[in-house]
């Protein structure tokens, strides 16, 4: 008799999820000599332990603590780049500016980037059919809780000037409900972080508006200022040129505004 299975609104676990996590871990520890000590089988066991046999709407940050412990890592706290709804460009920037780091440059972020996973209550099965959607089903699902946990820790580690890349093409350039708006902003430590500098990325070629004056950016400024952290904002009018100028800063066209 086929067992009844909960149907969730979101896509199921990424195919070959265990192999993918394990293989990414092995690659990461090869690429980053400072993490060579990490036992990837233990990392997978801890990852699996966070969600297997648990109701996928009842996951807690506590469930991920064994994984967090194994993935403990030091990144240069003054070289952190946060992003919201513009991951691709943030990652392209750090590919050129190789001394800056996004969450996906850390072991735990690298393992989970672009993946989906969930289990089922009381069975050791991984659910490849469907997983809970944050909006339609529940917020305490394995993927959301994972990113909330690692994002909080990443923000807590930041110091000096922290940069954040924001998508100027969206109706809410700063969204209080994004991971950046709901987790990272509130976990920057005022005793360590001097300034949050926002880079607002313009989408259209002819868009010359000052998006730093957008009401949602003013809202971000207000939240940050109340936390005794300075705030600054820059428009990136030409993201393609911006990347080119990061790569070739001596280019004569790079002295003008980008």
């Amino acid at each position: 008799v086929p067992r009844w299975r909960q149907q969730w609104s979101g896509p199921g676990t990424t195919k070959r999820f265990p192999e993918t996590v394990l293989a990414r871990c092995v690659k990461y520890t090869e690429i980053h000599p400072e993490m060579r000590h990490v036992d990837c089988q233990s990392v997978w066991d801890a990852f699996k332990g966070a969600f297997i046999s648990k109701h996928p709407c009842n996951i807690t940050e506590e469930d991920y603590q064994p994984l967090m412990k194994l993935g403990t890592q030091t990144v240069p706290c003054n070289k952190i780049l946060l992003w919201s709804r513009i991951k691709d460009l943030a990652h392209q920037f750090t590919q050129v500016q190789r001394d800056m780091f996004t969450l996906e440059d850390t072991l735990l972020g690298y393992l989970a980037d672009d993946l989906t996973w969930c289990g089922e209550f009381n069975t050791s099965k991984i659910n490849y059919q469907s997983c809970p959607d944050w909006r339609k089903d529940c917020s305490n699902n394995p993927v959301s809780v994972f990113w909330k946990t690692v994002s909080r820790r990443f923000a807590e580690a930041a110091c000096d000037v922290v940069h954040v890349m924001l998508n100027g093409s969206r109706s809410k350039i700063f969204d209080k409900n994004s991971t950046f708006g709901s987790v990272e902003v509130h976990n920057l430590q005022p005793e360590k972080v001097q300034t949050l500098e926002a880079w607002v990325i313009h989408g259209g070629r002819e868009d010359s508006r000052d998006l730093c004056q957008d009401p949602t950016i003013k809202e971000l400024e207000s939240i940050i200022s109340k936390r005794n952290i300075q705030f600054s904002c820059k428009n990136i009018y030409r993201p393609d040129k911006f990347l080119q100028c990061v790569k070739n800063p001596e280019d004569s066209s790079c002295t003008s505004e980008i």
Partner: nanobody, 126 residues
């Protein structure tokens, strides 16, 4: 700066096949997600295929889905693009490029960071 070398292009009739290769010297290709891109005459460069760092996951652009297959060799030294059922619209210069991250999402051609190689010319014509 990471730079890759593309090969395997040529002149082929419509409906024909080609296999392109992407290799690197001096660094480990298997440490990167790799994308294939093409630039048709008078058009913007477009992303057409990507394989993630594990080799388990692939993405394809709509224009090539079902006809092209991206793969890695076991040694991790080469990434291939098998192109079947070629059409005149597939004519262009084909490039490969690496990403620093595990997943394919870091390969957005419109804002590409990469130092492009020479590419390999593919011409589909009768």
């Amino acid at each position: 700066q990471v730079q890759l070398v593309e090969s395997g292009g040529g002149l082929v009739q419509p409906g024909g096949s080609l296999r392109l290769s992407c290799t690197a010297s001096g660094f480990r290709l298997d440490y990167y997600a790799i994308g294939w891109f093409r630039q048709a005459p008078g058009k913007e460069r477009e992303a057409i295929a990507c394989i993630d760092i594990t080799g388990f996951h692939t993405n394809y652009g709509d224009s090539v889905s079902g006809r092209f297959t991206i793969s890695r060799d076991n040694a991790g030294t080469t990434v291939y693009l098998q192109m079947n059922s070629l059409e005149a619209e597939d004519t262009g210069i084909y490039y490969c490029a690496p990403a620093r991250y595990a997943a394919c999402s870091a390969l957005d051609v419109k804002l590409s960071f990469t130092s492009w190689g020479q590419g390999t010319q593919v011409t589909v014509s009768s």
